[in-house]
């Protein structure tokens, strides 16, 4: 079967500092040495790319310097962290994995992780 399954948690709640982390795991049909991971956000039928990184197996993921994502990899598992989230960023975050090299190429897309972001209440001014 020429398919690659991608698993990710159904729901994640961002921290009060606007940070959300989740694991994206893929069942590789081949021995890939180069993998690309993309995080897509789906909200109101609109899809946007949040971040993407290509990495060599055994090496660290490297996102662009201005990316809101960071991550680490371990075997067929990628630990993704998205920072700077606000309530308006609540949505479905989909993990897309591509086995780039060596051939054959494989594509796998997860069902998505619903990330809920709640903006913290502003601290009331305290009287001294």
């Amino acid at each position: 079967c020429k398919a690659m399954h991608v698993a990710q948690p159904a729901v994640v709640l961002a921290s009060s500092r606007g940070i959300a982390s989740f694991v994206c795991e893929y069942a590789s049909p081949g021995k890939a040495t180069e993998v690309r991971v993309t995080v897509l956000r789906q909200a109101d039928s609109q899809v946007t790319e949040v971040c993407a990184a290509t990495y060599m197996m055994g090496n660290e993921l490297t996102f662009l310097d201005d990316s809101i994502c960071t991550g680490t990899s371990s075997g067929n598992q990628v630990n993704l962290t998205i920072q700077g989230l606000r309530a308006m960023d609540t949505g479905l975050y989909i993990c897309k994995v591509e086995l780039m090299y060596p051939p054959p190429y494989y594509l796998g897309i997860g069902n998505g992780t619903q990330i809920y972001v709640i903006d913290p209440e502003p601290c009331p001014d305290s009287d001294f």
Partner: antibody, heavy 118, light 106 residues
Framework: QVQLVESGGGVVQPGRSLRLSCAAS????????THWVRQAPGKGLEWVAV????????YYADSVKGRFTISRDNSKNTLYLQMNSLRAEDTAVYYC???????????WGQGTMVTVSS | EIVLTQSPGTLSLSPGERATLSCRAS?????LAWYQQKPGQAPRLLIY???SRATGIPDRFSGSGSGTDFTLTISRLEPEDFAVYYC?????????FGQGTKVEIK
């Protein structure tokens, strides 16, 4: 708006070369893999080649391997297909197509006709 | 290489009728798309992921199926729907297309 525009087609003799171009606009070209697909007169669609993102990974159909070279210049938002040792069976309309976020080919160019004939 | 076989080769129907197009894969596929092509035009993406409609595609077009058997259904044919339809798998290389089904006016 989001679009792809091919150019460079024409009539060429067997054994000769031709280079096709595909100009992208309206989207971040470097964020998408881009394919060439061809269609011989009166026939179906045949995938030809793909180049990914930064250009480091390329795949080819067996029918063109060793003869065609796909490349891209992200600074110019342009995709290329260098076709060498052309054969009569390479006669077709050549389309460039974007692999969208979900992997399917969501944007296509209008096509450019290549005729290989003596 | 995954081989996609479409049936029937030609479908003769009248406007307002329902069209059912079939695509069978030589082995199980996870990612299947459907395209529409009119004479002299480029293909247009209709369905991706076997059942998700692409942006701007009318809801009379629907896709279903999994594994090796897939179906494109046009619930009520409009005059502009008479065209050739192709299925494609895109989950692994090489990318392949079916040979196409022509939907013509009866």
């Amino acid at each position: 708006q989001v679009q792809l525009v091919e150019s460079g087609g024409g009539v060429v003799q067997p054994g000769r070369s031709l280079r096709l171009s595909c100009a992208a606009s309206g989207f971040t070209f470097s964020s998408y893999g881009t394919h060439w697909v061809r269609q011989a007169p009166g026939k179906g669609l045949e995938w030809v080649a793909v180049i990914w993102y930064d250009g480091s990974n390329k795949y080819y159909a067996d029918s063109v391997k060793g003869r065609f070279t796909i490349s891209r210049d992200n600074s110019k938002n342009t995709l290329y297909l260098q076709m060498n040792s052309l054969r009569a069976e390479d006669t077709a309309v050549y389309y460039c197509a974007r692999a969208g976020n979900w992997g399917a080919f969501d944007i296509w160019g209008q096509g450019t006709m290549v005729t290989v004939s003596s | 290489e995954i081989v996609l076989t479409q049936s029937p080769g030609t479908l003769s129907l009248s406007p307002g009728e329902r069209a059912t197009l079939s695509c069978r894969a030589s082995q199980s596929v996870s990612y299947l798309a459907w395209y529409q092509q009119k004479p002299g035009q480029a293909p247009r993406l209709l369905i991706y992921g076997a059942s998700s409609r692409a942006t701007g595609i009318p809801d009379r077009f629907s896709g279903s199926g999994s594994g090796t058997d897939f179906t494109l259904t046009i619930s009520r044919l409009e005059p502009e729907d008479f065209a050739v339809y192709y299925c494609q798998h895109y989950g692994s290389s090489p990318w392949t297309f079916g040979q196409g089904t022509k939907v013509e006016i009866k």
